[in-house]
Amino acid sequence: AITEAREEAKPYPLFPGPFPGSLQTDHTPLLSLPHASGYQPALMFSPTQPGRPHTGNVAIPQVTSVESKPLPPLAFKHTVGHIILSEHKGVKFNCSISVPNIYQDTTISWWKDGKELLGAHHAITQFYPDDEVTAIIASFSITSVQRSDNGSYICKMKINNEEIVSDPIYIEVQGLPHFTKQPESMNVTRNTAFNLTCQAVGPPEPVNIFWVQNSSRVNEQPEKSPSVLTVPGLTEMAVFSCEAHNDKGLTVSKGVQINIKAIPSPPTEVSIRNSTAHSILISWVPGFDGYSPFRNCSIQVKEADPLSNGSVMIFNTSALPHLYQIKQLQALANYSIGVSCMNEIGWSAVSPWILASTTEGAPSVAPLNVTVFLNESSDNVDIRWMKPPTKQQDGELVGYRISHVWQSAGISKELLEEVGQNGSRARISVQVHNATCTVRIAAVTRGGVGPFSDPVKIFIPAHGWVDYAPSSTPAPGNADPVLII
């Protein structure tokens, strides 16, 4: 007989196989079962006997020969129904059909689990023509089977718009257990139970699971997959893995580390990013988090002055962004600063303390007891005051700024005078007669100008008037703020 080969998927070579139907594997399969027989062991190949009905799709040709004899129904011959083989082995299976020669252009396609197999597959169709019929054998081979090759394979042929479908050939690839779920690393609370999960599949089934903790077997009697291990609690870090066993052998999962949550390590590298008169911006590098995320941090601030009462100011902030602006500080003061952070377990120790200083600021209060009177003989206005309390100068006094505003008949002009730090009095020339002079004084440091005092007004009469009564602001009580922690 002439053999014609049509390659369904180029460029694979021809794989001629024994006619009329064959199964070839690199190693004899463990078990091969005809599909229609409900998976009872049977011969690997059982060709359809003449005249025997067939369970697959059958096409009944309407065409008759010259003698008007009806053609027999077309159907694929029975072949092996179930092939079991090990991973990485080769397998070859086929379907065969005899087609009357009156049909032209018959092609056979392979389908797996309802999807047509296209492209680079080892699929070959061989034709064996005879006087009246052509035997067609479609072979499918896989050189090294993988789990993904598991499934139900069928052949399809189209004739006269009719589709003929073969019985399925079930391919079962067996191998070592394959993990579908492995234990995962966790951070757990000391002496608190937790669960780990392990799941592996065959075929072959069943898959049995052993758990291993720090290289000791937890369960000497295996559990069927999937397995959940309840660990009754740990006092120190442990490594867990699971072993999956089936008839093909053993697969070991990755080892996972289970850490015990602890209090964090103290922050390190506390540093000063910026200082002003009343605030300090600090940053820090967080310590080890103790396997539990930081929740918040506490900044502890104490005056470095040995004469201070040693009270500690505490500022709480979020753990991120490792940055905090400490406010409400005194100007030109020294502070010790430490940082502590917490997680769900507790607070870290305090970081190493660092020294930081605030800069000079503008005074926070105005000069006190401002008194203004007119010295008419010299045509001057005399101004006297008391300097603000040292604590509220917020720096070294460099002088005072005097604002005097002259108002008369709709005209207003403001003049500023600077006075050295030693004085507590000043004299300004009368600018306008028959006018009101409003005086305000502010203390000045290198940090800036403080607030102006409450305005003190004095009337400057026209020439010839005499008014010795001074104008003044009352001296307030002790306005020092007291911060109590």
Partner: antibody, heavy 118, light 106 residues
Framework: QVQLVQSGSELKKPGASVKVSCKAS????????MSWVRQAPGQGLEWMGW????????TYTDDFKGRFVFSLDTSVSTAYLQISSLKAEDTAVYYC???????????WGQGTLVTVSS | EIVLTQSPATLSLSPGERATLSCRAS?????MHWYQQKPGQAPRLLIY???NLASGIPARFSGSGSGTDFTLTISRLEPEDFAVYYC?????????FGGGTKLEIK
């Protein structure tokens, strides 16, 4: 509740054999291993080994290899300990104990006293 | 194999007192289990995996420790607590028991 019920006391002569039974109830027998523990008179506890109730494979500690045999009849949820060629020093109470994860013996039989005396 | 040494061998105390029983392993173990045995009875599981109370055991029993040193504590002794106590290690086969501590009424 889980129960392990052992067979009664035995008095045997040296060289004889004895078979102690341990019947389990109120749990799936083949899910947990079964251990055997020996306690000589006035002494402490000695773990003899265990049997896999699913596969039937026994494991013996070094001191109990040879004359001691663990077996099962899963159809009646029963484990057995057989001792052959009995010696006077085999005189002890033998306990079966259910064997769970982490080597915990969570339920115990009431014990079977085996006395070997001529 | 791992040797477990229990101390003291005998502990004489009165009801209401606190009992502390020690179990030391010859090398580090994963967990320690504790059993109570009364005369003529089978042992009963008290504490498993070092610190977990077994089902039906009163809360006056507690366990602690790690590595090689483990402790069973009975916070306030009741008359029914006078018995022999055994520790048993998990972590290295074969599993071994300690020699026992006899807790007796003073």
């Amino acid at each position: 509740q889980v129960q392990l019920v052992q067979s009664g006391s035995e008095l045997k002569k040296p060289g004889a054999s004895v078979k102690v039974s341990c019947k389990a109830s109120s749990y799936t027998f083949t899910t947990y291993g079964m251990s055997w523990v020996r306690q000589a008179p006035g002494q402490g506890l000695e773990w003899m080994g265990w049997i896999n109730t699913d596969s039937g494979v026994p494991t013996y500690t070094d001191d109990f290899k040879g004359r001691f045999v663990f077996s099962l009849d899963t159809s009646v949820s029963t484990a057995y300990l057989q001792i052959s060629s009995l010696k006077a020093e085999d005189t002890a109470v033998y306990y079966c104990a259910r064997y769970t994860n982490y080597g915990v013996f969570d339920y115990w039989g009431q014990g079977t006293l085996v006395t070997v005396s001529s | 194999e791992i040797v477990l040494t229990q101390s003291p061998a005998t502990l004489s105390l009165s009801p209401g007192e606190r009992a502390t029983l020690s179990c030391r392993a010859s090398s580090s173990v994963g967990y320690m289990h504790w059993y109570q045995q009364k005369p003529g009875q089978a042992p009963r599981l008290l504490i498993y995996a070092t610190s977990n109370l077994a089902s039906g055991i009163p809360a006056r029993f507690s366990g602690s420790g790690s590595g090689t040193d483990f402790t069973l504590t009975i916070s306030r002794l009741e008359p029914e607590d006078f018995a022999v106590y055994y520790c048993q290690q998990w972590g290295s086969l074969p599993f071994t028991f300690g020699g026992g501590t006899k807790l007796e009424i003073k």
